[in-house]
Interface confidence: low
């Protein structure tokens, strides 16, 4: 990743330093571990999404826990705190991306194997919308490779 040189980038760096992204890391790690423990069902099926197309998504509390989280109050608390932290980045797409990249980098050593890494990455990509926030238009979540992340 290129180092930012703009004033806006320095503003983002100070935002990142102030932010506590640990609850996001804890929420995601618990989520993928729970998914692994469940009965082999597809953890990405749309029926398990915190928003349902039949609801008016703009009226829903963006911090309400996803159906997964009702099984673990701790995780629900992590998600709410995580969303509160990510909310600080919504008006700056580049900064939201930096925050997500930081989460990915912080957890990369704890992820066991390519499959778990891909799962973590998918959940991380979903995180902004689970919080009712806008996903960054471009964001490379690869930790070691220089190329852009593509499915």
């Amino acid at each position: 990743r290129q180092q930012w040189e703009l004033q806006g980038d320095r503003r983002c760096q100070s935002q990142l330093e102030r932010a506590n992204l640990r609850p996001c890391e804890q929420h995601l790690m618990q989520k993928i571990q729970r998914d692994e423990d469940s009965y082999g069902r597809d953890p990405y099926s749309p029926s398990q999404d915190p928003y349902s197309p039949s609801q008016d998504p703009d009226r829903r509390d963006p911090y309400s826990p996803s159906p997964y989280d009702r099984r673990g109050a701790g995780s629900s608390q992590h998600q709410e705190r995580c969303c509160n932290e990510l909310n600080e980045f919504e008006n700056n797409q580049r900064c939201m991306c930096e925050a997500l990249q930081q989460i990915m980098e912080n957890q990369s050593d704890r992820l066991q194997g390519r499959q778990q890494e891909q799962q973590f990455k998918r959940e991380l990509r979903n995180l902004p919308q689970q919080c009712g926030l806008r996903a960054p238009q471009r964001c490379d979540l690869e930790v070691e490779s220089g190329g852009r992340d593509r499915y």
Epitope: D9, P50, P53, S54, P57, R94, Q129, G132, A135
Partner: antibody, heavy 117, light 107 residues
Framework: QVQLQEAGPRLVKPSQTLSVTCTVS??????????WSWIRQHPGKGLEWMGY???????YYNPSLKSRIAMSIDTSKNQFSLKLTSVTAADTAIYFC?????????WGQGTLITVSS | DIQMTQSPSSLSASVGDRVTITCQAN??????LNWFQHKPGTAPKVLIY???KLETGVPSRFSGSGSGTHFTFTISGLQPEDFATYFC?????????FGQGTKLEIR
């Protein structure tokens, strides 16, 4: 290779509802993190970004269209759709669907819809 | 909404020429800018993203620069296949907005 293809009636009468569907091939529309967008281009004019829908049904609409626009998603058909109510001649345009977020924005080739009696 | 002012609206040039198109935002968009190429009847294609990064597979004669509010797109050494319409798009804020487009024609 992911491809998007728009389909809809070429002609819509004023005051009626315009409907366009975008079929996605080469990727599941349920993949999280992407948003599926609609953009239009009036004849000889610039582009207007109309809004998006996430795979989970969450939407954002351009405030200039908010009272008339609705987007929906059909995961079983791997399609997403646009409806625009109370159309006038000013809604005559090429309608493009697109996939945005996380990587290269990917557009369909567009479909021209004319509003005329 | 963020207004994107693109100029010129049309441009005549010859094969081998160097051409430059500019896009100006009415507020800071950092580097959240795409440059697209569009040919009638085809899907618009991203050439440059994040204001200056070359999209995979795009020839190096295309380049972009700028940050904040002023952005430039350059084609060095025009090729016959480059005659098309080019437009910028900001994705820093919702709703995303576009420049009016520049039609590049053969002189």
């Amino acid at each position: 290779q992911v491809q998007l293809q728009e389909a809809g009636p070429r002609l819509v009468k004023p005051s009626q509802t315009l409907s366009v569907t975008c079929t996605v091939s080469g990727a599941s529309i349920t993949i999280g993190g992407y948003y599926w967008s609609w953009i239009r281009q009036h004849p000889g004019k610039g582009l207007e970004w109309m809004g998006y829908i996430y795979s989970n049904g969450r939407t954002y609409y351009n405030p200039s269209l908010k009272s008339r626009i609705a987007m929906s998603i059909d995961t079983s058909k791997n399609q997403f759709s646009l409806k625009l109510t109370s159309v006038t001649a000013a809604d005559t345009a090429i309608y493009f669907c697109a996939r945005e977020a996380w990587e290269t924005p990917l557009w369909g080739q567009g479909t021209l819809i004319t509003v005329s009696s | 909404d963020i207004q994107m002012t693109q100029s010129p609206s049309s441009l005549s040039a010859s094969v081998g020429d160097r051409v430059t198109i500019t896009c100006q935002a009415n507020q800071d968009i950092v580097n959240s800018l795409n440059w697209f190429q569009h040919k009638p009847g085809t899907a618009p294609k991203v050439l440059i993203y994040d204001a200056s990064k070359l999209e995979t597979g795009v020839p190096s004669r295309f380049s972009g620069s700028g940050s904040g509010t002023h952005f430039t797109f350059t084609i060095s050494g025009l090729q016959p296949e480059d005659f098309a319409t080019y437009f910028c798009q900001q994705y820093e804020n919702l709703p995303h907005t576009f420049g009016q487009g520049t039609k590049l024609e053969i002189r």
